[in-house]
């Protein structure tokens, strides 16, 4: 149409200038378009250089939009992580504060002379919660063994108790149950509660990490071409008012984000497992009940030891022989038997209930994040045509878009008419992130059954071990020595998204 040859390029000039490009590149009127590499080769207002600039710009705009969407999700996960982490830390700190406030009055020297052992126990629990590769059952067993030796000595200052005698006491301890049921109850409940708490918080960390890493995956050249065609070719071809057809936009973005959509199944599995593990936050083995009440088991244990003192001593002497009397030692002092401490639990304040409710709702909202991403970006960022009619931009001209919308994921892009996708070459970063999601899901499933995946039989298939990016230093794969507290490595941030200072919170 000869009349169209002289059509002005004013609208394109306006758009191109608004993008910050030099207006000297823009022709005054349409020119023949044989030079175009991406847009259809009709009469055009775009030079080769303009086409290249707009292609780069559309690519950058899509990456920005993608990063923005990811940032919103990351921020939500980071906020959740921080809220739960603060709450769990607060529970443990509260328990330790209660112990420090009530034990001196209740147990006198039985506590004050062993305050360090109690402080160390809370430190170990904190380390364990934050992802250190401690064996919780061993940690607790060693705490009770050390405590028994020290308390037995304190209860019998008139006796000489050399190391070999204390070793014998230790061997008898399991059968004698000097602390009553408290150690067993604490072991069972603490294992379940701490495993649930730490795996949930790690799950939030891994999810956030996956989103961050996937947002950095570059979009390929085929995607750049398709997005340019989708967004700017209408301007170049003199139909600047035509908005992209919705289905056309979806096909372009489904092709561009094919690898990301493959995260969907494992992402859903992870989020489902996280919602499920919150069921373990309630009851007498629940997070609030256990983490906030460690001191109550410790109180019950010392109460039991005092109650059982005479029977215990008789049985120890029967099993280990008569210890020598300490000539320098005082006589048995009845004043060491203190009054009992009535254990008070931290009543549920509703904080955890609120956190769980909000987390469940938000995790439900983002379950289909990866597969809904093309639709979300099209509707929010691409100024789509409001109707699938014959007035929208279909990539060639203003008109109806006829091809069907592709399915989700890489395999479904084999016949994508808009983006040439090599379905035999999945993106390796995304494959690695799928694996991290799988690993974290296995960890959560194990935690749901009360098992700590780090300490399951090494003969397992191993698919559940390792924490992916749930730990940001090597503590998750290192057992921390508990024999000497001076040899412990300080934990900075075994949970993602927390700063070094937060990693060393204490009461």
């Amino acid at each position: 149409d000869p009349a169209s040859k002289s059509r002005s390029c004013g609208e394109v000039r306006q758009i191109y200038g608004a993008k910050g490009f030099s207006l000297s590149d823009v022709p005054q009127a349409e020119i023949s378009g044989e030079h175009l590499r991406i847009c259809p080769q009709g009469y055009t207002c775009c030079t080769s250089e303009m086409e290249e600039n707009l292609a780069n710009r559309s690519h950058a705009e899509l990456e920005t939009a993608l990063r923005d969407s990811s940032r919103v999700l990351q921020a939500m996960l980071a906020t959740q992580l921080r809220s739960f982490d603060d709450h769990f830390q607060h529970l443990l700190n509260d328990s330790e504060r209660t112990l420090q406030a009530t034990f001196p009055g209740a147990f006198g020297e039985l506590y004050t002379q062993n305050a360090r052992a109690f402080r160390d126990l809370y430190s170990e629990l904190r380390l364990y919660y934050r992802g250190a590769n401690l064996h919780l059952e061993e940690t607790l067993a060693e705490f009770w063994a050390r405590l028994l030796e020290r308390l037995f000595k304190q209860l019998h200052p008139q006796l000489l108790l050399p190391d070999d005698y204390l070793d014998c006491l230790g061997k008898q301890a399991e059968a004698l149950r000097p602390f009553g049921e408290a150690p067993r109850e604490l072991r069972l409940r603490a294992t379940r509660a701490f495993v649930a708490a730490r795996s949930f918080v790690q799950g939030l960390g891994v999810a956030s990490d996956v989103v961050r890493k996937v947002a950095q995956v570059p979009l390929g050249p085929e995607c750049s071409r398709a997005v340019m065609k989708l967004v700017y070719c209408a301007h170049c071809l003199g139909v600047p008012g035509a908005r992209p057809c919705p289905d056309y936009c979806r096909n372009v973005l489904k092709g561009c984000l094919a690898n990301q959509a493959d995260l969907d199944a494992e992402w859903r599995n992870l989020l489902d497992s996280m919602v499920l593990i919150t069921d373990k936050f309630w009851g007498t083995s629940g997070v609030e009940s256990v983490i906030g009440s460690v001191h109550t088991w410790l109180a019950e244990a010392i109460n039991a030891l005092q109650d059982n003192r005479d029977t215990l001593t008789a049985k120890v002497i029967q099993g280990c022989g008569n210890p020598k009397v300490n000539p320098q030692g005082p006589g048995p002092e009845e004043k060491r038997r203190r009054g009992k401490l009535a254990p008070r639990e931290r009543p549920p304040s509703g904080t955890l209930e609120k956190l769980v409710s909000e987390a469940k709702a938000q995790l439900r909202d983002v379950q289909d994040f990866w597969i809904s991403l093309p639709g979300t970006l099209c509707s929010e960022k691409m100024a789509l045509s409001t109707a699938s009619d014959d007035r929208c931009w279909n990539g060639m001209a203003r008109g109806r878009y006829l091809p069907e919308v592709m399915g989700d994921g890489l395999a479904n892009q084999i016949n994508n008419p808009e983006v040439e996708v090599d379905i035999t070459k999945p993106d390796m970063t995304i494959r690695q992130q799928i694996m991290q999601l799988k690993i974290m899901t296995n960890r959560l499933r194990s935690a749901y059954n009360g098992n700590d995946v780090d300490f399951q039989d090494a003969s397992d298939d191993g698919s559940g071990s390792g924490s992916g990016d749930g730990c940001l230093d090597d503590l998750c794969s290192r057992k921390v020595s508990r024999k000497s507290s001076s040899s412990r490595t300080p934990l900075t941030h075994a949970l993602p998204g927390l700063s070094e200072q937060e990693g060393q919170k204490t009461s």
Partner: antibody, heavy 119, light 107 residues
Framework: QVQLQQPGPELVKPGASVKMSCKAS????????MNWVKQSHGKSLEWIGR????????SYNQKFKGKATLTVDKSLSTAYMQLNSLTSEDSAVYYC????????????WGQGTSVTVSS | DIQMTQSPASLSASVGETVTITCRAS??????LAWYQQKQGKSPQLLVY???TLAEGVSSRFSGSGSGTQFSLKINSLQPEDFGSYYC?????????FGGGTKLEIK
């Protein structure tokens, strides 16, 4: 099956104390909280407090602090509630009720012990 | 403390009818609400917890809904054994509080 057995009615004098029991069977006693709930004649229900049988830890409704004391005997799978300085206001049916993993809702209840305070 | 207001205080209905009881919390309790049924001279029985989860062994004629501050219990196709008193209970933060109750009588 889960059962919470409570003793029959109690008639007590004003100013006295009463200790009632709740014997649990059919489940692991230490795995569930034991709650105590008051129901005055023809009235609604009031939560008194709960005890964690695994460690004896207690949480009370502020209104009943000093009035009720909750304890357990693990070896007998039995929870106890002692009410002291009784007045006619304390005449009511007292229920024990188990709560656990159902977000702390009370899924099994005892048949209740009726306490009448009268001189 | 969180106040729980139940309505109506009493209602009469016939076998086969559908009835709805409502419960309002004085502040947001999310989904943490339970419903109990109590028959004359008996102890309460859990029907629904967490707003809408049916307790074990409870007939599917009962259904709970709502969250935040407004909740309801719906009983479809009333049966003779459904008559009695119904209580809602917040199980959000202690002290756990109950509604005043709704007495459901046969018309």
């Amino acid at each position: 099956q889960v059962q919470l057995q409570q003793p029959g009615p109690e008639l007590v004098k004003p100013g006295a104390s009463v200790k009632m029991s709740c014997k649990a069977s059919g489940y692991t006693f230490t795995d569930y909280y034991m709650n105590w709930v008051k129901q005055s004649h023809g009235k609604s229900l009031e939560w008194i407090g709960r005890v964690n049988p695994s460690n004896g830890g207690t949480s009370y409704n502020q209104k009943f602090k000093g009035k009720a004391t909750l304890t357990v005997d693990k070896s007998l799978s039995t929870a106890y509630m002692q009410l002291n300085s009784l007045t006619s206001e304390d005449s009511a049916v007292y229920y024990c009720a188990r709560s656990g993993e159902n977000y702390y809702a009370m899924d099994y209840w005892g048949q209740g012990t009726s306490v009448t305070v009268s001189s | 403390d969180i106040q729980m207001t139940q309505s109506p205080a009493s209602l009469s209905a016939s076998v086969g009818e559908t009835v709805t009881i409502t419960c309002r919390a004085s502040e947001n309790i999310y989904s943490y609400l339970a419903w109990y049924q109590q028959k004359q001279g008996k102890s309460p029985q859990l029907l629904v917890y967490n707003g809408k989860t049916l307790a074990e062994g409870v007939s599917s004629r009962f259904s709970g809904s709502g969250s935040g501050t407004q909740f309801s219990l719906k009983i479809n196709s009333l049966q003779p054994e459904d008559f009695g008193s119904y209580y809602c209970q917040n199980h959000y933060g202690v002290p756990w509080t109950f509604g005043g109750g709704t007495k459901l009588e046969i018309k």
